[in-house]
């Protein structure tokens, strides 16, 4: 499946919105820094393209889940959050449509279960961290910066997939 060019633009807009959402300086939150253990190896180049789509979808869906909680709504600017949701939703739709376009060809298993579980556990660690830090402004800033980093890495995978074609 060829992810549309708009998907790439959407990824860049998502990163831009995440940057705009910053409310406090990360430097004032150094004591709250945390290593969430992003499973970077699950986004490596060893996958077939069909197998990466569910992993990318998982990443975006989990970001959407994380930022659509009541606690998140209270932490961020509502206008930026709505724009952010729109971008994530469009990317999920693109990836979903990709699976449907695969009909008629030999359908590869969607399950790269280890990779998907690794992504889920990563987001569980983030959720647990936020709870432990009582959803403080610094905790949210640390998480925002982390999501920017991990989303950027997963976006790079998408780009490498496109360049492979």
């Amino acid at each position: 499946c060829d992810l549309p060019q708009t998907h790439s633009l959407g990824s860049r807009r998502t990163l831009m919105l995440l940057a705009q959402m910053r409310r406090i300086s990360l430097f004032s939150c150094l004591k709250d820094r945390h290593d969430f253990g992003f499973p970077q190896e699950e986004f490596g180049n060893q996958f077939q393209k069909a197998e990466t789509i569910p992993v990318l979808h998982e990443m975006i869906q989990q970001i959407f889940n994380l930022f659509s909680t009541k606690d998140s709504s209270a932490a961020w600017d509502e206008t930026l959050l709505d724009k952010f949701y729109t971008e994530l939703y469009q990317q999920l739709n693109d990836l979903e449509a990709c699976v449907i376009q695969g009909v008629g060809v030999t359908e590869t298993p969607l399950m790269k279960e280890d990779s998907i579980l690794a992504v889920r556990k990563y987001f569980q660690r983030i959720t647990l961290y936020l709870k432990e830090k009582k959803y403080s402004p610094c905790a949210w800033e640390v998480v925002r910066a982390e999501i920017m980093r991990s989303f950027s890495l997963s976006t790079n995978l998408q780009e490498s997939l496109r360049s492979k074609e």
């Epitope: 949701y85 449907i100 359908e107 279960e113």
Partner: antibody, heavy 126, light 110 residues
Framework: EVQLLESGAEVKRPGSSVRVSCRAS????????ISWVRQAPGQGLEWMGR????????NYAQNFRGRITITADKSPLTAYLELSSLRFEDTAVYYC???????????????????WGQGSLVTVSS | EIVLTQSPGTLSLSPGEGATLSCRAS???????LTWYQQKPGQSPRLLIY???SRATGVPDRFSGGGSGTDFTLTISRLEPEDFAVFYC???????????FGQGTKVEIK
Amino acid sequence: EVQLLESGAEVKRPGSSVRVSCRASGDTFSSYPISWVRQAPGQGLEWMGRILPALGVTNYAQNFRGRITITADKSPLTAYLELSSLRFEDTAVYYCASPSADIIPSILGTTLFAFWGQGSLVTVSS
Amino acid sequence: EIVLTQSPGTLSLSPGEGATLSCRASQNVSRHYLTWYQQKPGQSPRLLIYGGSSRATGVPDRFSGGGSGTDFTLTISRLEPEDFAVFYCQSYHSPPPVYTFGQGTKVEIK
């Protein structure tokens, strides 16, 4: 686990409108769509439409366009179905249904209905 | 728009027997996007099989799903008394999102 609780039974006149509500509790996310599915007496299931509460984005089945409106509140997470210009054949049990965040992989999550409300009977009668 | 046709309409079987239910699509459907539900009288539907062949939580392993393209099956290896119900297949297509149900197959006690 998600629990979906629908409003009570309604009796309506032909030509009028009905509004059914569905309140979600438990492990809910406004980032997953809530759908409405109906079942006429002794008949099969029919998808009517869905809403993504986080954005208010709606999608409606062709059969209902023009007389269906689905809305939602994010807190507490509640979806509403409004059906206008009611006809006798709209007599049915109306279910709200949602996916599960636990489905692996999540790309399948929004394609199915893991959780269902108890159903709300709407009777159209003169 | 995709049409799902289920057959047979009714299946009369005894407990302990096996059952094979068919769901035929009017056009190709990704097996990943084919789901089966069970509905007992007076109850809401219950998710049974998703992704064509994955069992939902708590579903016994006597239920299995298979097929691809336009032909899908739900197999119950040995019917238990609690299995008698109406079974629906459902497909998903996007964009825009459309959910389609088959008309149902009733599995009744012979």
